[in-house]
């Protein structure tokens, strides 16, 4: 089975760890695919190790373990993320994470101060 935090949040400009945990008494992991919606983020395989898709190579760092660290987050990164575990002989298991990227606290504070500042 796949165990993961269903919903996570992080600040714009910050980073977040995407993590799925696979547990099985018999099956061994042979490959893990990570996707942002339908777009490939990175792949790990026992044979080849990690490959980060070129589109994300400046913002995605493999690990910890079979997870990913996603850096320099933008509001556009809000959405669904999927891990797909290819196992032998168990088959394919999928996990889903929803990431909400929020405005940084600095931005929120700045906006609040601006809104409450007296005119003139």
């Amino acid at each position: 089975t796949i165990d993961t935090k269903r919903n996570i949040s992080a600040e714009e400009g910050g980073s977040v760890i995407l993590q799925c945990h696979f547990s099985s008494d018999t099956a061994e992991v042979t490959q893990v695919d990570w996707k942002q919606q339908d777009q490939l983020l990175a792949i790990y395989s026992v044979d080849l190790g990690w490959h980060v898709a070129s589109v994300f190579s400046d913002r995605v760092v493999p690990g910890p373990s079979l997870g990913l660290t996603f850096q320099s987050l933008t509001m556009n990164d809000t959405g669904e993320y999927f891990c797909t575990y290819h196992t032998y002989p168990g088959g394919i298991y999928k996990g889903r994470i929803f990431l909400k990227v929020q405005e940084s606290s600095d931005d929120r504070n700045g906006l609040a101060q601006f809104q409450t500042a007296p005119l003139g």
């Epitope: 490959q31 695919d33 339908d38 777009q39 792949i43 395989s45 044979d47 080849l48 490959h51 898709a53």
Partner: antibody, heavy 118, light 107 residues
Framework: EVQLLESGGGLVQPGGSLRLSCAAS????????MHWVRQAPGKGLEWVAA????????SYADSVKGRFTISRDNSKNTLYLQMNSLRAEDTAVYYC???????????WGQGTLVTVSS | DIQMTQSPSSLSASVGDRVTITCRAS??????LNWYQQKPGKAPKLLIY???SLQSGVPSRFSGSGSGTDFTLTISSLQPEDFATYYC?????????FGGGTKVEIK
Amino acid sequence: EVQLLESGGGLVQPGGSLRLSCAASGFTFSSYSMHWVRQAPGKGLEWVAAIKSSGSSTSYADSVKGRFTISRDNSKNTLYLQMNSLRAEDTAVYYCARVPYDYWLDYWGQGTLVTVSS
Amino acid sequence: DIQMTQSPSSLSASVGDRVTITCRASQSISSYLNWYQQKPGKAPKLLIYAASSLQSGVPSRFSGSGSGTDFTLTISSLQPEDFATYYCQQSYSTPLTFGGGTKVEIK
């Protein structure tokens, strides 16, 4: 530098057999799935067969199933395609290709021409 | 089997033109879509993998987009060495299948 070098092509009569080889160098051959793809003269690309890194799993196009056998010898860094009961429609340039993560074909050999004709 | 339909089958363009080639899958293939360039007498060369990732060493004028069933290869400014035939290919399931190709010719 990654290199794939096919050999074994040639002229064969219908019903005959050929064995193609693909010698790999410049990478850890035993870590990659390998595929064969063919291209008939003046036509597009057609996938033929695939084999996983360990050789434990293979798959074939319906058009060659039961006639062609893909295999590999990781100790020799070599991929093979045994072609039996050849038909005129098997005439093509045959390419071997490296396939990381079973996803994309990132390096191809130069191809070897197989001509099936009486 | 998943059918891959490419359009147009051929096009004429000039150096400097922006060229767009489309590929449609007969069912959803997520982002399991790759693009290749082939010149006469040569083996295909990988340009774009996973729908939008540029293969190492490929010029940045090539880009890919799309997911599901509809995909696009764009050459932002056509160069003399780009006149060739381009193929899309799905790796969502076996048998792997290729589009019929798009031949880019000099106008």
